[in-house]
């Protein structure tokens, strides 16, 4: 036998102007339910049967998945960070091919004084997390690094790494100027060619919420937005209250469809609602027109 | 890692001589080592370095009375300090550069090994 549930329906027209009746479950009664037929073809829009229930894809819901969600997870790294490819010359080590070895005693000693150079240099820059050498060259050395910056995610992330890779520069380009060998003497933990400062490359955390939201809304892409609330971004679509974009539906429901949301307005024993917001209220015993 | 030990430091009349010796746990040959005090309530200062190649430098106040050496074969780094006064009293330390560490005969840049240190005390 089919499924047979106690409900009570309440009318609900589109802002178009069709009524649609929608059922709402006492589930104060016990249901049992016994399904016919095929499964698969129960779940639509690319949901999959467990045994159970239909197990739907973002960005719908519901028993068939035949609804749309209002909001959908979007999940921004808790961290974004940069990577700078600089070069510099140090000037008070001489190169010897153990340098290349990094299991040596010499790339070990090298990498710790250099790494503790970089940290004096860089120490004011919150972004700060550290150096990488990837490279040892002849000229006297010749370092080859990466110097890593990492900040929490918020919208501005970007603006935080730009500024930061620019401190950087200038720092770099500072102890680089300064800290120099005079009449052969280094009076520094390390010296530095001037000329043999280079900014190579620079690589930010590309990531961006608004992408996600359109990639995850899928053919609704066009009506989901992001908006922020504590610095964390919400892909929501008007029908989502609360927010800025939220469609305000007075006495309606909001329903997500291929063109977009719209308002499907109540019908009540003593009124029923139309216009596109369900704002427009006629009383049924006057036929009444109120705002 | 090198560990450095030195000796020879002592109570000592003003005028008179001391020889500090530094002994080093691993080959010293292509590092530059160097002496560094450092009295009660003082700052650190840098009394005397050498480079690989032997070429030395020495801080103002001990030019002329004190001379540093080193030698390889034996991985040992020394400090003669003559005409000893009151003003040296301090705990003397060695120290060794990175390897392959040059431009290094003048005492102000940091040093990545270094001992613990021996006490010279003048005082008549």
């Known amino acids: 036998p089919l499924a047979t549930i106690p409900v009570s329906t309440t009318s609900l027209t589109s802002s178009e102007g069709s009524t649609i009746s929608t059922p709402s479950v006492d589930i104060s009664t016990p249901v049992t339910t016994s399904i016919v037929g095929d499964q698969c073809s129960r779940c639509k829009n690319g949901g999959f049967w467990d045994g159970l229930k239909c197990q739907c894809l973002t960005p719908y819901y519901g028993e068939s998945c035949e609804e749309v969600v209002n909001s959908i997870d979007i999940a921004p790294p808790e961290t974004v960070s940069a990577q700078m490819e600089l070069t510099v010359t140090v000037t008070s080590v001489k190169f010897t091919d153990e340098l290349k070895n990094h299991s040596s005693q010499e790339f070990r000693e090298f990498n710790k004084t250099f790494t503790e150079q970089m940290n004096i240099v860089y120490s004011g820059i919150p972004e700060y997390v550290g150096v990488n050498i990837t490279n040892l060259r002849l000229g006297s050395v010749v370092v080859e690094h990466d110097v890593l910056l990492r900040t929490k995610y918020t919208p501005e992330y970007k603006t935080a790494l730009d500024n930061a890779t620019e401190v950087v520069k200038q720092k770099i380009t500072k102890v680089t100027t300064e800290q120099i060998m005079t009449n052969d003497n280094c009076s520094a933990l390390m010296c530095f060619n001037t000329t043999g400062t280079q900014v190579q490359n620079i690589t930010v955390t590309q990531y961006d919420p608004v992408e996600e939201c359109r990639q995850k809304a899928e053919e609704y892409e066009d009506y989901f937005l992001v908006e922020y609330r504590d610095q964390k971004p919400y892909c929501i679509s008007p029908c989502e209250s609360g927010f800025n974009a939220s469609k305000n539906c007075n006495h309606g429901k909001c329903q997500m469809s291929q063109n977009g949301a719209r308002c499907l307005c109540v019908t009540t024993e003593t009124h029923w609602y139309s216009g596109e917001d369900c704002n427009q209220g006629t009383q049924k015993s006057h036929h009444h027109h109120h705002h | 890692e090198v560990q450095l030990v030195e000796s020879g430091g002592g109570l000592v009349q003003p005028g008179r001589s001391l020889r500090l010796s530094c002994a080093a746990s691993?080959?010293?040959?292509?590092?530059?080592m160097g002496w560094f005090r450092q009295a009660p309530g003082k700052e650190r200062e840098g009394v005397a370095g050498?480079?690989?190649?032997?070429?030395?430098g020495y801080a103002d106040s001990v030019k002329g009375r004190f001379t540093i050496s080193r030698d390889n074969a034996k991985n040992s780094l020394y400090l003669q300090m003559n005409s000893l006064r009151a003003e040296d009293t301090a705990l003397y330390y060695c120290?060794?550069?990175?390897?392959?560490?040059?431009?290094?005969?003048?005492?102000?840049?940091?040093?990545?090994?270094r001992g613990q240190g021996t006490m010279v005390t003048v005082s008549s």
């Open positions: 691993g080959d010293i040959t292509r590092r530059c």
């Open positions: 120290a060794a550069s990175i390897l392959n560490r040059v431009g290094c005969r003048q005492l102000s840049y940091e040093y990545i090994y």
């Open positions: 050498i480079s690989e190649d032997g070429i030395t």
